[in-house]
């Protein structure tokens, strides 16, 4: 037989069990279903996530945060994180169209132990696991990362979403559902099955926000606070502990009825003790407060700890570090973790991209470049140093090595280096063509003051970066403007190449520069570049335009410089033409045979409307 005192203890035990039930199992579960991951629409989409034809497989990670904290660096995945299983192995089939990629089976489930916040942020990452012969096992790399902020009520239908990350597209659905006995849009109301006892004990009102009828959701009084109120009968509004008023919107600093955790009612005559340490519930993240003789104690839900349950207990096993961050934590499953973020990311979960250039580290107007692994400053003329902090002197007392000349301008200086040298003082050997500066197959030729590009047919621009007809840039129409049908299509050699070849073949000592102005020679074939007295055909000599066009034909491109009108002609026969500057000198001695011939041995000159010249382009 159970004594009345024992009966009271049992009742209170039942009360506590009901109250702490949400702490021992989740209030609900966020579920994410990935439908497809693959190349998005439009050009430039990747063919396959697998590199170098190695087999690979995908997996996904999701991080959930309450509220609108998608990019808040200080917030961890407070609602939880989950890692999917590995998907089926995929190997790219050469020539096959890019498919939607095989996905892991099942849902990603993130249990949440506190109320569902209604508004949440997500980060979904798609990872690639390469299964080649890597030393040390598979290699992982982040393929795509999407983030968003959404409003979602628990218990609602699946919501569909499409997110794009670069050239990839991710299609997915998500929902939040409550785990019994929790119900409601926030999973905060508890539903008691019909078979459960209807009262906690003799003479006591229900001690937790329980609904009598699980199958028929109650309609509480209009305006009843969904966070702090509940109802047992339709039209009722009963308040959780710490709240009062007809709609449970007024906070009170009192404990209530019998159970330290039980709800109070604004309409019931409960015994009201004085203020206690648990008033206002100091326990965060769904922790339960119990009074102790000196203070209070928080019983924390799984995943949180600390005096007030304020510390997230997500562990490295949950995969909380994003963007390749390294997770470091103790062996104890409940120990905390720290994410060591790669360069360019910060935040407790490495979820926030750092715009390191926003700190404006480059001084004196330098351009900041965030390369991920490092910052670089591209300095304005006249400044140098890792952060452009050095204001360079002018040319006074400054020597440029290896035949370089110092050029002043605006208080700054630079060395204009001779061919093959570079650096601030021209002390470094440099190959200006090493960086492959000519686009679309253009040929690069090193030159006194840099380089010049000989463009492939159909391209133009200082670096051959502009296709003339992009729809068929690699093959011009049957007869490009300025070429007769049947003429061979060739790379047009930039005039500056003459100097380069001359220097290489004959040596600088053999290059006789005859600087004098005279008329057009009859033996055009003996010159590197034949001149023509009539400017009927022009070729743009610095490869700004490598298509020859009939003057006035209106169907070919030309440079912004009018090559038919020298702007300055000095008395020594050196033509100075506006940017890019061109220096033309006559060559008296024939150094080479004609560069190439056309049909039937007919000489086809590289035409230029000045005395036959070797050109260098600045």
């Amino acid at each position: 037989m159970v004594s009345p005192r024992m009966s009271g203890l049992l009742s209170q035990t039942v009360i506590l069990a009901l109250i702490f039930l949400p702490q021992t199992r989740p209030a609900g579960v966020f579920e994410l279903q990935i439908h497809s991951f693959g190349p998005g629409p439009g050009p430039g989409a990747p063919r396959s996530p697998c590199s170098a034809r190695l087999p690979c497989r995908l997996f996904f990670r999701v991080c959930l945060k309450p509220g609108l904290s998608e990019e808040a660096a200080e917030s961890p995945c407070a609602l939880g994180a989950a890692l999917s299983a590995r998907g089926p192995v995929y190997t790219e089939q050469p020539g096959a169209p890019a498919p939607d990629l095989p996905l892991p089976d099942g849902l990603l489930q993130v249990p949440f132990r506190d109320a569902w916040p209604g508004t949440f942020s997500f980060i979904i990452e798609t990872w690639r696991e390469e299964l080649g012969d890597q030393i040390g096992g598979p290699a992982w790399s982040l393929l795509a990362r999407v983030a968003g902020r959404r409003r979602l009520a628990a218990g609602g239908p699946w919501a569909r979403d499409i997110q794009r990350a670069g050239a990839w597209e991710l299609r997915f659905s998500y929902r939040a559902r409550c785990e019994p006995p929790a119900v409601g849009t926030a999973c905060t109301r508890l539903c008691r099955p019909r078979s459960a006892p209807s009262r906690c004990g003799p003479g006591l009102r229900p001690c937790a926000p329980l609904e009598d009828e699980c199958e028929a959701p109650l309609v509480c009084r209009a305006g009843c606070s969904p966070e702090h109120g509940f109802c047992e009968q339709p039209g009722e509004c009963r308040c959780l502990e710490g709240w009062t008023g007809p709609l449970c919107t007024v906070p009170v600093s009192t404990s209530s009825c019998l159970s330290p955790r039980g709800p109070s009612s604004a309409t019931t005559g409960c015994l009201v003790p004085g203020p206690g340490p648990c008033d206002g519930n100091p326990c965060a993240n769904g922790g339960s407060c119990s009074e102790t003789p000196r203070s209070f104690e928080c019983t924390c839900p799984r995943g949180f700890y600390g005096l007030r349950c304020e510390v997230s207990g997500v562990t490295c096993a949950d995969g909380p570090c994003f963007n390749g961050g390294l997770c470091v934590g103790g062996a104890d499953p409940d120990s905390a973790y720290i994410c060591h973020c790669p360069p360019g990311f910060q935040g407790s979960n490495c979820e926030k991209r750092v715009d390191r250039c926003s700190l404006q580290p480059c001084r004196n107007g330098g351009l900041c470049l965030d390369l991920g692994h490092a910052l670089r400053c591209r300095c304005r003329a006249g400044f140098a140093g890792p952060r452009c902090e050095h204001d360079l002197d002018d040319c006074a007392g400054r020597a440029c090595a290896n035949g370089g000349t110092c050029v002043e301008g605006g208080g700054a200086h630079r060395c204009s280096c001779a061919l093959g040298f570079g650096g601030r003082d021209c002390r470094e050997r440099a190959d200006p063509c090493a960086a492959r500066p000519c686009a679309h197959g253009g040929r690069c030729y090193a030159h006194f003051s840099g380089l010049v590009c000989a463009c492939a047919p159909g391209y133009m621009g200082a670096r051959c970066e502009f296709p003339v007809h992009p729809d068929g840039a690699s093959a011009l129409p049957a007869a490009p403007p300025g070429l007769r049908p049947g003429d061979p299509q060739r790379y047009l050699l930039p005039p500056a190449l003459g100097l380069l070849v001359a220097a290489g073949v004959a040596g600088a000592a053999l290059l006789l520069v005859h600087v004098r102005r005279r008329g057009h020679s009859q033996d055009a074939g003996s010159r590197l570049l034949a001149g023509t007295p009539e400017p009927s055909v022009h070729a743009l000599p610095d490869a700004l335009n490598n298509l020859r066009t009939q003057e006035g034909s209106g169907d070919g491109p030309s440079s912004s410089v009018d090559w038919n009108r020298p702007e300055d002609v000095d008395p020594q026969g050196i033509y100075v033409i506006s940017a890019p500057s061109i220096y033309a000198r006559e060559v008296a001695t024939p150094l080479f045979p004609p560069l190439h011939t056309g049909r039937a041995g007919q000489r086809q000159h590289l035409l230029f409307p000045y005395p036959s010249s070797i050109l260098s382009v600045k």
Partner: nanobody
């Protein structure tokens, strides 16, 4: 990925003027070579004007002296000032960028210019 958005197209009378703008999403436009192309109905797309990273410009012969290409790196934009417009300038004008870092060309969606009285 560089996104290019053209604006400024529309209907203009022969002899009139129009300025096309192209805004690039990249914050390093000074490292992009930029150009304007056009495509008239039934014709191939063709280069109108281009401007290299060093500021040197190239023009299609038929627009030389009438069109001017310019760039404003601070605004991540390139412009095409079109004067003395003719009926044969009617076309869809496309912005083009060449990304030297990746040897990658990018195209805008195009803006229609109609020259008609």
């Amino acid at each position: 990925e560089v996104q290019l958005v053209e604006s400024g197209g529309g209907l203009v009378q022969p002899g009139g003027s129009l300025t096309l703008s192209c805004a690039a999403s990249s914050s390093s436009v000074q490292y992009l070579s930029m150009a304007w192309y056009r495509q008239a109905p039934g014709k191939k797309r063709e280069l109108v004007a281009g401007i290299s990273t060093d500021g040197s410009a190239v023009y299609f012969d038929s627009v030389k002296g009438r069109f001017t290409i310019s760039r404003d790196n601070a605004k991540n934009s390139v412009y095409l000032q079109m004067n003395s417009l003719r009926a044969e300038d009617t076309a869809v004008y496309y912005c083009y960028a060449y990304n030297w870092s990746y040897a990658q060309p990018y195209w805008g969606q195009g803006t229609l210019v109609t020259v008609s009285s």
